[in-house]
Amino acid sequence: QPSCRQEEFLVGDECCPMCNPGYHVKQVCSEHTGTVCAPCPPQTYTAHANGLSKCLPCGVCDPDMGLLTWQECSSWKDTVCRCIPGYFCENQDGSHCSTCLQHTTCPPGQRVEKRGTHDQDTVCADCLTGTFSLGGTQEECLPWTNCSAFQQEVRRGTNSTDTTCSSQ
């Protein structure tokens, strides 16, 4: 059995040239004619040179999985799904996303260092000493309040709470 070259496929004991992306095999090669290819029908595709008798079905972006269609399927390219705003892709297979997760909400004591995108979760960072954050989508930690000369510091600030001052 012959081993075929790259971008050829085996038919019986003959090697046939593959079809171009966007096409599938309509008729395998013979003594005098090469591979006869046919364009992929709507909602199907082939992304690479291939020896397929049928094109592959285009992917569908499931809104229930937090997905939206970013790029429609073409005869040579599968549908590209992206996560809806506020979500990022957890499972990426090439250019295809199968599951999305909601962006992490930064907990109290942390700020948003890098906002979440369609393919990356939010990155949180701790507040430095002398600052605090209630968490959420806050991008800057706020400096603790300095109690005035007429106020007394009741409770020192933490990374998640401000200083408490009393006016007694």
Partner: antibody
Amino acid sequence: EVQLLESGGGLVQPGGSLRLSCAASGFTFSSYGMNWVRQAPGKGLEWVSIINPSGDTTTYAQKFQGRFTISRDNSKNTLYLQMNSLRAEDTAVYYCARGRGAFDYWGQGTLVTVSS
Amino acid sequence: EIVLTQSPGTLSLSPGERATLSCRASRSVGKYLAWYQQKPGQAPRLLIYGATSRATGIPDRFSGSGSGTDFTLTISRLEPEDFAVYYCQQYGSSPPVTFGQGTKVEIK
């Protein structure tokens, strides 16, 4: 003797239409796939379209899809190419050629000039 | 689509010399490659099909070799009538059938 004779070329304005014909003789026309190939002045060969022997399957190079239509009349041993929405860059000699793979016989060509 | 690249663009030789023309495909076309000769004001004429088979009536000084991506047309001894433009064409995977850009064989 196999003969292919194109006709129908000429001067046409941009946006206009033209129908080329290719009269075949000397072989069983209805048994062969037929092609149109064009050649712009001073340039190389460019495949345009193919039609199968019975005429029920046609294929085009992507750039001609929608503008050009290949057809055949096996009772008249004639191949046709209907060209619409012609552009200056369609100026070329248009050849009909016989064959599914290698093209073993060619006509002498007909010149199509698209100009205002 | 499969792109065919012919080299050299022009070949300047004298009658009686050997001409070697090259055609390279961007991916494998198997054995499904043809060579054509075209003279000014004339239609192309099929010389070689299936990479190595001579078409009807073609003199045996014309020969083809190669498979996959690399092909050669050899004219063993150039005759005056052989000075012309030569095109390779793949039909390994179609549509589209594609042609090389041509090699001109001129008299030195």
